[in-house]
């Protein structure tokens, strides 16, 4: 028998420094977690103790804090090189700055293979990107070889900016021939490493012949066997075992997100490469693990440029700004309310006495809210805090839509409710009631909108044939998160101001904020 230790991260989202327990900015260092310096300590400890170790990343290193805003991926290459990652799969966010923003800072600088079997380059890009990422890589581990085959969410064109010269194929269809190639070279230990979410990870384990282990990302899935060590609630045991169509037991793992945990999986293979056993758990990277001094010193060196960029206080909050995915992808969250209020405030234009304002409505995909802000830091809000909440460098745009399009958008918001998907809408100037007992596509039971042609704003039922102005992220205007109906049916689209700037201006103007959860989004069962 031969034993392999797989260490894995996913959805780190630019958390190079240690963070608070909820993965926002570290306030009390003695209770902070994660960060590359602490990760390196644990990785090195395991490398010294165990013979056959791989360190893998399942994508979405890009995007999430000021580190990415300023360094644009150079920080990812530098620190992943320093930690000596063995391989990385491309995530959707690796394309947030376009293909050039992936090629120059990361693909050309990484000293480890970057993988995706289901992304195919075409046109002039094909020669430019050739060899910079690979479908698979065979790695020598001790006296054996291990094949790593990569995959990326085929939804990436809807979630990021990969451009028109990259084709994202079906994961399973693309993976099988690449695994077959490895099998024809006697590679009998194969890891699928990728970024398509836990449901797809399980399908890959079930359907792709020859894959022994699946290491995933994208859905921020937390798996754990036994009593979990922090706030995350396990979605299943670690590893999650899938029975493949050809009768094998295939372990599937993921390690939550934000560098809070280091996935730790031990696999035992027989001489033919069959998995005999698999066990492990994510390791919570809490303050009991010291930060490596040399990596920490490097972080501090790189940090100087960031400090100049964004440490001035914009204003204060006297309440917790809940931007967690657990809230904003499931229900009304006060961070969503704050952002929507800022978006409307930024568009106050009193140009007609008949209208108190030309626009009253805001919609915002919950998946675009990427971090909370803790008020227990003297209430201070900085640009850096906001860059973690709104890291994508988007704009808040003005569109005109028919009521019927808005109704479709709100149905889409909850069509697969409960899977922590980003399309759940936060709102401003809208009151919506959902009945989740109804079938998808028929769950919006009440949709009232704030009038504009009125001296005293009040909520009236949405009219299907009326044209409304709405402020929303450019991401939604472009059909992101599956909101194709907005892209296809919008009557006018005017691009607006940078998202962080809109919110920072609002906070500076208000000086002290205290957004509440106030019943903009409600749920009912059968009462309408």
């Amino acid at each position: 028998a031969w034993e392999l230790t797989i260490l894995h991260t996913n959805d780190v989202h630019s958390r190079l420094e240690q963070t608070s327990e909820d993965s926002s900015k570290c306030v009390n260092a003695s209770r902070c977690m994660g960060g590359v310096a602490r990760l390196f300590t644990k990785v090195q400890q395991i490398r010294r103790a165990e013979p056959n170790v791989l360190l893998l990343d399942a994508g979405d290193q890009y995007q999430g804090t000021i580190w990415f805003t300023v360094y644009k991926g150079a920080e990812v290459a530098h620190f992943m090189n320093a930690l000596r990652y063995d391989a990385m799969a491309l995530g959707n966010h690796e394309f947030d700055n376009g293909v050039e923003g992936l090629i120059e800072p990361l693909l050309k600088e990484a000293k480890f293979p970057i993988l995706s079997a289901n992304i195919k380059a075409k046109g002039p890009l094909a020669s430019q990107i050739s060899g910079l990422y690979l479908p698979y890589k065979v790695l020598p581990v001790g006296d054996e070889v291990v094949g790593i085959v990569g995959y990326t969410s085929k939804e990436t064109p809807f979630l990021s900016n990969p451009g028109t010269n990259l084709v994202f194929e079906d994961e399973i269809t693309a993976l099988q021939p690449e695994v077959d190639k490895l099998k024809t070279l006697n590679v009998n230990k194969i890891i699928a490493l990728g970024h398509s979410g836990f449901e797809m990870d399980k399908l890959i384990a079930q359907k792709v012949r020859g894959v022994d282990v699946v290491v995933g990302g994208h859905s921020n899935t937390f798996l754990y066997t036994g009593n979990p060590p922090s706030k995350e609630v396990p979605a299943g045991k670690y590893p999650f075992i899938v029975t493949s169509d050809d009768g094998r037991k295939v372990p599937v793992v993921q390690a939550y997100a934000f560098g809070k945990y280091l996935g730790y999986l031990k696999i035992e293979f027989d001489e033919r490469g069959n998995v005999i056993s698999s066990h492990g758990n994510p390791i919570l990277l809490n303050s009991s693990i010291p930060e490596d001094p040399s990596i920490k010193a490097d972080i501090n060196k790189w940090r100087i440029k960031l400090d100049n960029y964004s440490t001035q206080e914009l204003g204060k909050t006297i309440v917790y700004l809940d931007g967690s995915s657990q809230s904003c992808r499931f229900r009304e969250c006060n961070m969503g309310n704050l952002i929507c209020d800022a978006m409307i405030n930024n568009n106050l234009r009193h140009t007609d006495e008949m209208f108190w304002n030309h626009v009253s409505m805001c919609i915002l995909n919950g998946g675009g809210i990427r971090s909370p802000i803790d008020e227990r830091n003297n209430g201070t809000i900085t640009w850096e805090n906001l860059a973690a909440v709104l890291p994508f460098g988007g704009t808040f745009d003005l569109v005109q839509l028919k009521g019927s399009t808005l109704k479709k958008a709100f149905e889409h918001s909850v069509h697969r409710y409960g899977q922590s998907t980003g399309e759940f809408l936060q709102v401003g100037g809208i009151h919506v009631v959902y009945d989740l007992s109804r079938k998808p596509g028929d769950r919006v039971v009440k949709l009232d909108v704030l009038c504009t042609k009125c001296r005293v704003p009040s909520y009236d039922p949405l009219k299907m044939d009326e044209v409304y102005k709405v402020i929303l992220p450019n991401f939604l205007a472009n059909g992101g998160d599956g909101f194709q109906m907005i892209k296809d049916e919008l009557l006018r689209h005017d691009s607006g101001d940078q998202d962080i700037n809109v919110v920072s201006t609002y906070i500076s103007k208000m000086k002290v904020i205290y957004p509440a959860v106030e019943g903009r989004i409600k749920f009912s069962t059968g009462s309408h």
């Epitope: 050739s130 060899g131 690979l134 479908p135 890589k137 065979v138 020598p140 006296d143 054996e144 070889v145 695994v179 077959d180 190639k181 099998k183 024809t184 070279l185 006697n186 590679v187 009998n188 012949r209 020859g210 033919r272």
Partner: antibody, heavy 121, light 107 residues
Framework: QVQLVQSGGGLVQPGRYLRLSCVAS????????MHWVRQAPGKALEWVSG????????TYADSVKGRFTISRDNAKNTLYLQLNSLTAEDTAVYYC??????????????WGQGTLVTVSS | DIQMTQSPSSLSASVGDRVTITCRAS??????LAWYQQKPGNAPKLLIY???NLRSGVPSRFSGSGSGTDFTLTISSLQPEDFATYFC?????????FGQGTKLEIK
């Protein structure tokens, strides 16, 4: 001793077919992936096709995809290559080769003696 | 496809000479490179695997080095039986590709 013995080559007309065989001895055939590599007269080696140890996975060079089929019969310790729709460009010496495992990954450590396929009218 | 370019294409040398053949890959192939020797009318024979590992039974005068894109095969002191054609081959990405060969002839 460890060896691969080939048969099945010969002269064939364009558009016709041929089947090459490669019999293994001296090692556990079903522990190894196997490949075909060809060499046109006076030219370099060209990889053609490969098959996994159990036969469930196969892969082909673009130049032969859809025309050639690799297969194996582990009970008979035999590797096959079915060559269909042959053209003059397929004229070459065809070698079967064993793919090295683990430490020898990526190298062909045992080769057959080769068999000449000539496609001509 | 990864192109493998060998140089020189042919080489004349004498018994006892030190000879170096180079192989360049069109992209990074790590260490997944093999070297073969082929004599006229015979099948190729594996000499070096993983860029620098000598196959058992192969004389120690043969050595390989390199990683990434640039590789060399060195014969420290040519023997009469070494006159043959030498091929490099990469196994990083399919299709597996070979160099065009270097013919080593007696001067």
């Amino acid at each position: 001793q460890v060896q691969l013995v080939q048969s099945g080559g010969g002269l064939v007309q364009p558009g016709r077919y041929l089947r090459l065989s490669c019999v293994a001895s001296g090692f556990n055939f079903d522990d190894y992936a196997m490949h075909w590599v060809r060499q046109a007269p006076g030219k370099a080696l060209e990889w053609v096709s490969g098959i996994s140890d159990g036969g469930s996975a196969t892969t082909y060079a673009d130049s032969v995809k859809g025309r050639f089929t690799i297969s194996r019969d582990n009970a008979k310790n035999t590797l096959y290559l079915q060559l269909n729709s042959l053209t003059a460009e397929d004229t070459a010496v065809y070698y079967c080769a064993r793919a090295g495992s683990s430490w020898y990954f990526g190298a062909f450590d045992i080769w057959g003696q080769g068999t000449l396929v000539t496609v001509s009218s | 496809d990864i192109q493998m370019t060998q140089s020189p294409s042919s080489l004349s040398a004498s018994v006892g000479d030190r000879v170096t053949i180079t192989c360049r890959a069109s992209q990074n192939i790590g260490s997944w490179l093999a070297w073969y020797q082929q004599k006229p009318g015979n099948a190729p024979k594996l000499l070096i695997y993983r860029a620098s590992n000598l196959r058992s039974g192969v004389p120690s005068r043969f050595s390989g080095s390199g990683s990434g894109t640039d590789f060399t095969l060195t014969i420290s002191s040519l023997q009469p039986e070494d006159f043959a054609t030498y091929f490099c081959q990469q196994a990083t990405i399919f299709p597996l590709t070979f160099g065009q060969g270097t013919k080593l002839e007696i001067k």
